[in-house]
């Protein structure tokens, strides 16, 4: 009796079960009564990543330098190519097809995780007793000048944005 | 049913291409396979390559460099030339559908001589 | 490349004996599947090989009981318990198990 189901690495067809083609290699023929499936490796920049029954392997994706992408690991036949962002740029999604320049944190916002080829600058407020007044993907909010340690006094307020100004302290008559 | 027929010159030169015609009907070349096999006078049998149905090729490994398989499957036709022939590629000349082992072409027989 | 050896090169029987013919391969012909794709063929002169035997053991539509074959691995058998005179031809052994396919040397089946 000609089988429902098949076992794992294998697939119906014609009311017999044929073995799936390896990682790396392509469905040329299914199986017959005088012969196993017939499979062949898939062509150089091509790859499957899968036990298949595939016809056809899949290309390489190609990291495109003009869209800022350069390729993170080379493709094998079994896998396919990672690309990755040139310097300075990070990818727009998952699959990283394009790149996009890494965000600058505006004044009163610092760098909480610098930006890699994958993930973009992720910016945080700075809180009070911070403060960043440049546009920045590197700089972390800096902690306000502590004037008492130089001897000085709070001439004015720092703010996000602002450092705060110190003075000389009052002379006492 | 399946049916297979060689055709093609019966004499060769030496250093010449041998070229051949398998003609199949009843089954489909975009679906299946076509082997080409030969059998020198009086000796046993060599499997000389396939096309399968996508057109990808496999070659036996002692004729590769001079043996070329294609098809054209609205002909239903696929085609044999073997380049540089001698005379030890004299031989009957078969072809056989993939899956039809049961069903072989009546042969052809090529002689290489001047 | 798989080489398949055939023995004995001709075999000199009556008609009503039984035939035993051998193949030998020279590597395993078990497929990682399991299957084992040896076939025997009968070939008579001027004419085109009929297939007989398929995945070592199992007779091809209309050919009579008396041809079985049997074996595993890397020997194989195939086994006419009767020889009919129309049974007195040149016979194959052929492996699809791996590309290159092979074919044995034949071994010759004549009457005595």
């Known amino acids: 009796e000609p089988p429902t189901a098949c076992r794992e690495k294998q697939y119906l067809i014609n009311s017999q079960c044929c073995s799936l083609c390896q990682p790396g290699q392509k469905l040329v023929s299914d199986c017959t009564e005088f012969t196993e499936t017939e499979c062949l490796p898939c062509g150089e920049s091509e790859f499957l990543d899968t036990w298949n029954r595939e016809t056809r392997c899949h290309q390489h994706k190609y990291c495109d330098p003009n869209l800022g992408l350069r390729v993170q690991q080379k493709g094998t036949s079994e896998t396919d190519t990672i690309c990755t962002c040139e310097e300075g740029l990070h990818c727009t999604s998952e699959s990283c097809e394009s790149c996009v320049p890494h965000r600058s944190c505006l004044p009163g916002f610092g760098v909480k995780q610098i930006a890699t080829g994958v993930s973009d600058t992720i910016c945080e407020p700075c809180p009070v007793g911070f403060f960043s007044n440049v546009s920045s993907a590197f700089e972390k909010c800096r902690p306000w000048t502590s004037c008492e340690t130089k001897d000085l006094v709070v001439q004015q307020a720092g703010t996000n944005k602002t450092d705060v100004v110190c003075g000389p302290q009052d002379r006492q008559r | 049913q399946v049916q297979l027929q060689e055709s093609g010159p019966g004499l060769v030169k030496p250093s010449e291409t041998l070229s051949l015609t398998c003609t199949v009907s009843?089954?489909?070349?975009?679906?299946?396979?076509v082997h080409w096999i030969r059998q020198p006078p009086g000796k046993g049998l060599e499997w000389i390559g396939v096309?399968?149905?996508?057109?990808?090729?496999n070659y036996n490994p002692s004729l590769k460099s001079r043996v070329t398989i294609s098809k054209d499957n609205s002909k239903n036709q696929v085609f044999l030339k073997l380049s540089s022939v001698t005379a030890a590629d004299t031989a009957v000349y078969y072809c056989l559908g993939h899956g039809h082992f049961d069903v072989w072409g009546q042969g052809t027989l090529v002689t290489v001589s001047s | 490349e798989i080489v398949l050896t055939q023995s004995p090169g001709t075999l000199s029987l009556s008609p009503g004996e039984r035939a035993t013919l051998s193949c030998r391969s020279s590597q395993s012909l078990v497929h990682s599947s399991g299957n084992t794709y040896l076939q025997w063929y009968q070939q008579k002169p001027g004419q085109a090989p009929r297939l007989l035997i398929y995945?070592?053991?199992n007779r091809f539509s209309g050919i009579p009981d008396r041809f079985s074959g049997s074996g595993s691995g890397t020997d194989f058998t195939l086994t006419i318990s009767r020889l009919e005179p129309e049974d007195f031809a040149v016979y194959y052994c052929?492996?699809?198990?791996?590309?290159?396919?092979?074919f044995g040397q034949g071994t010759k089946v004549e009457i005595k």
């Open positions: 052929s492996q699809t198990t791996h590309v290159p396919w092979t």
């Open positions: 009843g089954f489909s070349l975009p679906t299946s396979g």
């Open positions: 995945k070592v053991s």
């Open positions: 096309i399968w149905a996508g057109g990808d090729t």
